[in-house]
Amino acid sequence: VSITKCNSDMNGYCLHGQCIYLVDMSQNYCRCEVGYTGVRCEHFYL
């Protein structure tokens, strides 16, 4: 899978994580920080 950094317009896309652009899948993906989940790492869990 080809990946790259997200475009600058997606800077705020991932609330608590790193935004990765999955080129072959034509979509952005959030790699969440520890303790966070959700498509955009918007949910905190203990």
């Epitope: 790259t4 475009n7 600058s8 317009d9 997606m10 705020g12 896309y13 609330l15 652009y21 080129v23 034509s26 979509q27 952005n28 498509v39 955009r40 918007e42």
Partner: antibody, heavy 116, light 106 residues
């Protein structure tokens, strides 16, 4: 199956406002950005602006600043684009476009005609 | 706002010809360019994103290349069904479409 279903065609008088809706199904708009693009008859594609429904952040193209308002209602999974002070040059097909989780998934378009 | 200058605005070519369209950005867009095909009365169809990544179901005669500010879209062998208007779109910083290129058969 993911869908963006837009409201029906509108005819408006110059100076009036129009509000076009874009209802998402099959996905949560909070996971995406919703962009708005228009195309006047026989003309090219023109990006108008976008909203991040989760944060409520909006960005508009400079030429529409002050005349366009993009909103989202996450409870109904619907985005809206309101354009005010309509003039004949605003006659166009208006499209909502999903981006973020999937690159550029388009609604079917809404024709807005501005005529006196 | 980033400006996208697309050329030519129209072209006429024969079936089987190689067709090339260019888009120049007013600043580096880091390969974040997409190409759309639009036929009359239809919504635009995404052909290519991230400069050169073909979408599923798009024929391999379509291709894209470029970096920095200069990008190219190519149809290696023009087919009758390719008659349409083609648009580039930068999506690095917000979004800007090129002016479009109308492709006709000679």
């Amino acid at each position: 199956q993911d869908q963006l279903v837009q409201s029906g065609a509108e005819v408006k008088k110059p100076g009036a406002s129009v509000k076009v809706s874009c209802k998402a199904s099959g996905f949560n708009i909070k996971d995406t950005y919703i962009q708005w693009v228009r195309q006047a008859p026989g003309q090219g594609l023109e990006w108008m602006g976008r909203i991040d429904p989760l944060r409520g952040n909006r960005k508009y193209r400079e030429k529409f600043e002050g005349r366009v308002t993009i909103t989202a209602d996450t409870s109904t999974n619907t985005a809206y684009m309101e354009l005010s002070s309509l003039r004949s040059e605003d006659t166009a097909v208006y499209y909502c476009v999903r981006s973020g989780t999937l690159f550029d998934f388009w609604g079917q378009g809404t024709l807005v005609t501005v005529s006196s | 706002d980033i400006q996208m200058t697309q050329s030519p605005s129209s072209l006429s070519a024969s079936v089987g010809d190689r067709v090339t369209i260019t888009c120049k950005a007013s600043q580096d867009i880091h390969k974040y360019i997409a190409w759309y095909q639009q036929k009359p009365g239809q919504a635009p169809r995404l052909l290519i994103q991230y400069t050169s990544t073909l979408q599923p179901g798009v024929p391999s005669r379509f291709s894209g290349s470029g970096s920095g500010t200069d990008y190219t879209f190519t149809i290696s062998s023009l087919q009758p069904e390719d008659i349409a208007t083609y648009y580039c779109l930068q999506y690095d910083n917000l979004r800007t479409f090129g002016g479009g290129t109308k492709v006709e058969i000679k």
